[in-house]
């Protein structure tokens, strides 16, 4: 399955929209920094098969949806902004969902890279939790603001390399 | 609201197979993963697997693999779960049971569905 | 597989007492995804605490969870009528996802 160039485009805006959507200076943010544990390998496209990395990608779009789809995220951002980023969410999904249908149909019994679709999961618990214990805070959004957009750009780099497979 | 509404109690002859309906509302369908657990009469839960309704793919529990299967109808908002070669240690009541992340990981349950598998 | 072990298997205590239920893991569980359950009979379970020590919505605060590693505990301070239930911990730290065996808290 070839993922369209409108794909990379639609996370490349994606990205852009993220950044806009910052309403604090991250300076102020400093004593609210966390390490999230991005999990990089997990979006090292030479490690597994083209298939499994779709659905790789796939749970890190569809998690970063749900994140941002919470009423708490709403109260927290410039709704037309969230919506247009919400959007550009969305149409990645059916995209990724399109191939990964098409892959499980071709296989005899469909592989799952159990592992890495868990610590892409885990990933996002952890960003859940940092939210809940900051109580939701201007300053907790913008940090996760920061790492959501971090985990993009390892998802566009991963993109690349799988364009490059075909 | 959330919602997770299960098919009826079955009865089945060992050998046979039986398929379990879990129709969800109240939230969108295809963004949360959905698991099984099942529990014999008197026993604890056991986790069998789980679905993502977005695209088909499933990971199932080691001791169901290749006994188990997981399908989902993105159009009714359903998932099924049919389990094979049904044996009397299948009779359990069989729960489907919502993904998700922090506070929402099986916070949301079916009803549960008994199933009793006798000669 | 991470065995959950809980202990004990049956704990009888009088309303008003406090109640303490163990959950011991088999190799080491991230806290984050470590949870309790309740459940009565005839019913499904029940989310109680999330992440280890977190409440879920609606639990009523004489309930809480500590622990880390293996070792997990699920404290009730002040038992009411209506707790006395089988209390399950469960992890997802890893496949495949397993839950203890249930600790039945029953009255004296």
């Known amino acids: 399955c070839d993922l369209p160039q409108t794909h990379s485009l639609g996370n490349r805006r994606a990205l852009i929209l993220l950044a806009q959507m910052g309403r604090i200076s991250p300076f102020s943010c400093l004593k609210d920094r966390h390490d999230f544990g991005l999990p990089q390998e997990e979006f090292d496209g030479n490690q597994f098969q083209k298939t499994q990395a779709i659905s790789v990608l796939h749970e890190m779009i569809q998690q970063t949806f749900n994140l941002f789809s919470t009423e708490d995220s709403s109260a927290a951002w410039e709704q037309s902004l969230l919506e247009k980023f919400s959007t550009e969410l969305y149409q990645q999904l059916n995209n990724l969902e399109a191939c990964v249908i098409q892959e499980v149909g071709m296989e005899e019994t469909p592989l799952m890279n159990e592992d890495s679709i868990l610590a892409v999961r885990k990933y996002f618990q952890r960003i859940t939790l940092y939210l809940t214990e900051k109580k939701y805070s201007p300053c907790a959004w913008e940090v996760v603001r920061a790492e959501i957009m971090r985990s993009l750009s390892f998802s566009t780099n991963l993109q690349k390399i799988l364009r490059r497979k075909d | 609201q959330v919602q997770l509404v299960q098919s009826g109690a079955e009865v089945k002859k060992p050998g046979a197979s039986v398929k379990v309906s879990c129709k969800a509302s109240g939230y969108t369908f295809r963004n949360y993963w959905m698991h099984w657990v099942r529990q014999a009469p008197g026993q604890g839960l056991e986790w069998m697997g789980e679905?993502?309704?977005?695209?088909?793919?499933?990971i199932y529990a080691q001791k169901f693999q290749g006994r188990v299967t997981m399908t989902r109808d993105t159009s009714t908002s359903t998932v099924y779960m049919e389990l094979s070669s049904l044996r009397s240690e299948d009779t359990a009541v069989y729960y489907c049971?919502?993904?998700?992340?922090?506070?929402?990981?099986?916070?949301?349950w079916g009803q549960g569905t008994l199933v009793t598998v006798s000669s | 597989e991470i065995v959950l072990t809980q202990s004990p298997a049956t704990l009888s205590l009088s309303p008003g007492e406090r109640a303490t239920l163990s959950c011991s893991a088999g190799?080491?569980?991230?806290?984050?995804?470590l949870y309790w359950y309740q459940q009565k009979p005839g019913q499904a379970p029940r989310l109680l605490i999330y992440?280890?020590?977190n409440l879920a919505s609606g639990i009523p605060a004489r309930f809480s969870g500590s622990g880390s590693g293996t070792d997990f505990t699920l404290t009730i301070s002040s038992l009411e009528p209506e707790d006395f239930a089988v209390y399950y911990c469960?992890?997802?730290?890893?496949?495949?996802?397993?839950f203890g065996q249930g600790t039945k808290l029953e009255i004296k």
């Open positions: 049971a919502r993904g998700g992340l922090g506070p929402a990981w099986f916070a949301y």
């Open positions: 190799s080491s569980v991230d806290s984050s995804e």
């Open positions: 679905i993502n309704p977005s695209h088909g793919r499933t």
């Open positions: 992440s280890t020590s």
């Open positions: 469960h992890q997802w730290s890893s496949y495949p996802f397993t």
